[in-house]
């Protein structure tokens, strides 16, 4: 079999509040009931895990309480939101999808979404 295809947008600009959202879509070769989604950040060949969630098809994604990620799922599509981003967090955010159950296991890795984060300028002091 070929690698499971995972599609995600090439570029996303974070909002002024440091929030970025993007869709991660995977072409499921089978009828998975349990899916694991991991967001990885790649910068200068260093890769770190940003967040991860396992969900049952038809149910909500559940990230850890202290996660900077939230998300919803619809069919083979996952809508991911990352918050608390700052300029130093600019990088390539890669969606990794694993079909955990039932067997066989499948793994697909997206080509990444380049998220640009621009720290807002501080508001100038007002005379009023």
């Amino acid at each position: 079999c070929k690698a499971m295809h995972v599609a995600q947008p090439a570029v996303v600009l974070a909002s002024s509040r440091g929030i970025a959202s993007f869709v991660c879509e995977y072409a499921s070769p089978g009828k998975a009931t349990e899916v694991r989604v991991t967001v990885l950040r790649q910068a200068d060949s260093q890769v770190t895990e940003v967040c991860a969630a396992t969900y049952m098809m038809g149910n909500e994604l559940t990230f850890l309480d202290d996660s900077i990620c939230t998300g919803t799922s619809s069919g083979n599509q996952v809508n991911l939101t990352i918050q608390g981003l700052r300029a130093m967090d600019t990088g390539l955010y890669i969606c990794k999808v694993e079909l955990m159950y039932p067997p066989p296991y499948y793994l697909g890795i997206g080509n990444g979404t380049q998220i640009y984060v621009i720290d807002p300028e501080p508001c100038p002091d007002s005379d009023f």
Epitope: T38, V47, L107, G112
Partner: nanobody, 126 residues
Framework: EVQLVESGGGLVQPGGSLRLSCAAS????????IGWFRQDPEKEREMVSC????????KYADSVKGRFTISRDNSKNTVYLQMNSLEAEDTAVYYC???????????????????WGQGTRVTVSS
């Protein structure tokens, strides 16, 4: 279905050599990273060595540099790990892993691996 089958493990004396083989099947992409990892009961699984299918970029753990050599035979979909000057600290179960990456992905990063073989045990002891 992706399958990775390791062979070549065994018992060897310190200073000896072994050659591990990993035969991959069920995966038709021309682009992937494939490598060797090891794990013993007290430790996390660690990457030993890895090679990229296209271009042949390689990576080695510091602890095995100069002693281990990874190579591949794309016609047989097989990757080899030649292990020389083996030490007691090399004792572990060795796993073959595959990462279905593309050119944008960092070479041989453990986060991208997900397909694993069953493992082959290497014991270095006198």
């Amino acid at each position: 279905e992706v399958q990775l089958v390791e062979s070549g493990g065994g018992l060897v004396q310190p200073g000896g050599s072994l050659r591990l083989s990993c035969a991959a099947s069920g995966f038709s992409s021309d682009y992937y990273d494939i490598g060797w990892f090891r794990q013993d009961p007290e430790k996390e699984r660690e990457m030993v060595s890895c090679i990229r299918s296209s271009g042949g970029s390689t990576k080695y753990a510091d602890s095995v540099k100069g002693r281990f050599t990874i190579s591949r035979d794309n016609s047989k979909n097989t990757v080899y790990l030649q292990m020389n000057s083996l030490e007691a600290e090399d004792t572990a179960v060795y796993y073959c892993g595959l990462a279905p990456i593309s050119p944008v992905h960092a070479v041989c990063n453990q986060h991208y691996f997900g397909y694993w073989g069953q493992g082959t045990r290497v014991t270095v002891s006198s």
